[in-house]
């Protein structure tokens, strides 16, 4: 997995008027890291993990950068023509990556009302856009605006690639992020599904990195994908992740089913707890 820094900026307009506030979220290696969500931006580390990475310092630099980016995006939204009545959003997602071989990738993506309409490879300066006519119109609109200020295009957008990588390297220097491994806590629960059946759920939490194998096995053989229901692998707010997998089995056969977990080269199996059903309602739909 490459190391990555991801900026997600969102600005809003109401009835054609661009709002003064904006939302910025920064993810480091896929984890929520910094956030600005007020009228006046104040960079806030997301949890102890982010504070550890940033160290004992104020986040003035981050605040200044994120505020500047927010202003730029508001100006861009103001130049999008044909805004209909009501609420609209412009989102800019910027990602840079450092791979294990030290190669880098940087890209920038624009979304209007949640729909992608323009992307740029920040290394090659190559622009791409979806085929839809709406996306093409929006893309031309925004590109023309960016071209109007040639200085801005050359400096600001060119610098984004270098700045992003510079910040990422700075955060990685903390050593907190660097190739850390946190093993998951795994627990298995059971709930009544229907007469004669129970739903067994296996939850893994508090693990890092996010790659994990979690599946149900019967007598040591994996159940097929379509007999299992998986939850997404989601950040749990502590710089780690959580996920789950569930399946439905016959009551009385619990001892034959195990939850298999593999994470960062380590693996374990977890039996279904015996005894009374613990939870009466099943989340299995």
């Amino acid at each position: 997995e490459p190391h990555s820094l991801r900026y997600n900026l969102t600005v809003l307009s109401w009835d054609g008027s661009v709002q003064s506030g904006f939302l910025t979220e920064v993810h480091l290696d896929g984890q929520p890291f910094l956030r600005c969500d007020r009228q006046k931006c104040r960079a806030k580390p997301q949890g102890q993990w982010a504070e550890d990475v940033l160290g004992n310092k104020t986040w003035d630099r981050e605040t200044r950068d994120l505020t500047g980016n927010g202003k730029d995006l508001r100006m861009t939204l103001a130049h999008i023509k044909d805004q209909k009545e009501g609420l609209h959003s412009l989102q800019e997602i910027r990602v840079c990556e450092i791979h294990e071989d030290n190669s880098t990738r940087s890209s920038q993506h624009f979304y209007y009302d949640g729909e992608l309409f323009l992307s740029q490879n920040l290394e090659t300066k190559e622009w791409t856009m979806p085929q839809s006519s709406r996306a093409q119109t929006l893309a031309m609109n925004v590109r023309n605006f960016l071209k109007e200020d040639a200085m801005k295009t050359k400096t600001h957008y060119h610098a984004m690639h270098a700045d992003c990588l510079q910040e990422l390297r700075r955060y990685l220097k903390s050593g907190v992020v660097l190739r850390r491994t946190v093993p998951p806590m795994v627990n298995v629960t059971r709930s009544e599904a229907s007469e004669g059946n129970i739903t067994v759920t296996c939850r893994a939490s508090g693990f890092y990195p996010w790659n994990i194998t979690l599946s149900w096995r019967q007598d040591g053989v994996s159940l097929s994908h379509d007999t299992q229901q998986w939850g997404d692998v989601l950040p749990d707010g502590n710089g780690t992740y959580q996920t789950w997998v569930a399946t439905r089995i016959c009551q009385g056969e619990e001892q034959r089913f195990t939850c298999y977990m593999e994470h960062s080269g380590n693996h374990s199996t977890h039996p279904v707890p015996s005894g009374k059903v613990l939870v009466l309602q099943s989340h299995w739909q």
Partner: antibody, heavy 122, light 106 residues
Framework: QVQLVESGGGLVQSGGSLRLSCVAS????????MNWVRQAPGKGLEWISY????????YYADSVKGRFTISRDNAKKSLYLQMNSLRDEDTAVYYC???????????????WGQGTMVTVSS | ETTLTQSPFSLSASVGDRVTITCRAS??????LNWYQQKPGKAPKLLIY???SLQSGVPSRFSGGGSGTDFTLTISSLQPEDFATYYC????????FGGGTKVDIK
């Protein structure tokens, strides 16, 4: 006693079909996952198909995928293997085998039938 | 698909010998490995499951070891009834057998 008995083998033309059966006795078939394994003359064992107790997980070896179908009828205590588009290389002794239900099992086959011979001729 | 490679292909040994057969997996299969014995004209018989657990009724001279990609089946003191072909089998990633190792009389 616990046993599995295969039947349905025989001589068949290349491109033809055959249906193998495996009848269980001495245990409740519905509780167990089952397999078909074959062994060509003078060769090693080749796993070809798996079906779990609820018939909701089925696997095939690449060599038979799309041609063979595993199924079971728990009420009849029977496991089946429908073999279509048979080829010369399908000639083998076909065994049905039960997956052990012992705690901590890793997909081991604890009970095997005596096998039934299938010969495909061109 | 996980492939299992057994070695040696065959071996000659005498009664009382200590015999070791190896099975190597193309990827880590943790302990999802089983061992079988097969005699000519007979169905295979389960000896070891989960890499090292002895199946009920199997003599204690048989033992299994290893995890990940490298596994062994050891017969501590070969008996006349042990001359047979031995197979490993995995269930970590679908199901596959190794090619077999024939143990015959020296």
């Amino acid at each position: 006693q616990v046993q599995l008995v295969e039947s349905g083998g025989g001589l068949v033309q290349s491109g033809g079909s055959l249906r193998l059966s495996c009848v269980a006795s001495g245990f409740t078939l519905s509780r167990y996952s089952m397999n078909w394994v074959r062994q060509a003359p003078g060769k090693g064992l080749e796993w070809i198909s798996y079906i779990n107790s609820r018939s909701n997980t089925i696997y095939y070896a690449d060599s038979v995928k799309g041609r063979f179908t595993i199924s079971r009828d728990n009420a009849k205590k029977s496991l089946y293997l429908q073999m279509n588009s048979l080829r010369d290389e399908d000639t083998a002794v076909y065994y049905c085998a039960r997956v052990s239900d012992i705690t901590g099992n890793t997909g081991a086959f604890d009970i095997w039938g005596q096998g039934t011979m299938v010969t495909v001729s061109s | 698909e996980t492939t299992l490679t057994q070695s040696p292909f065959s071996l000659s040994a005498s009664v009382g010998d200590r015999v070791t057969i190896t099975c190597r997996a193309s990827q880590s299969i943790h302990n999802y490995l089983n061992w079988y014995q097969q005699k000519p004209g007979k169905a295979p018989k389960l000896l070891i499951y989960a890499a090292s657990s002895l199946q009920s009724g199997v003599p204690s001279r048989f033992s299994g070891g290893g995890s990940g990609t490298d596994f062994t089946l050891t017969i501590s003191s070969l008996q006349p009834e042990d001359f047979a072909t031995y197979y490993c089998q995995q269930s970590y990633n679908a199901l596959t057998f190794g090619g077999g190792t024939k143990v015959d009389i020296k």
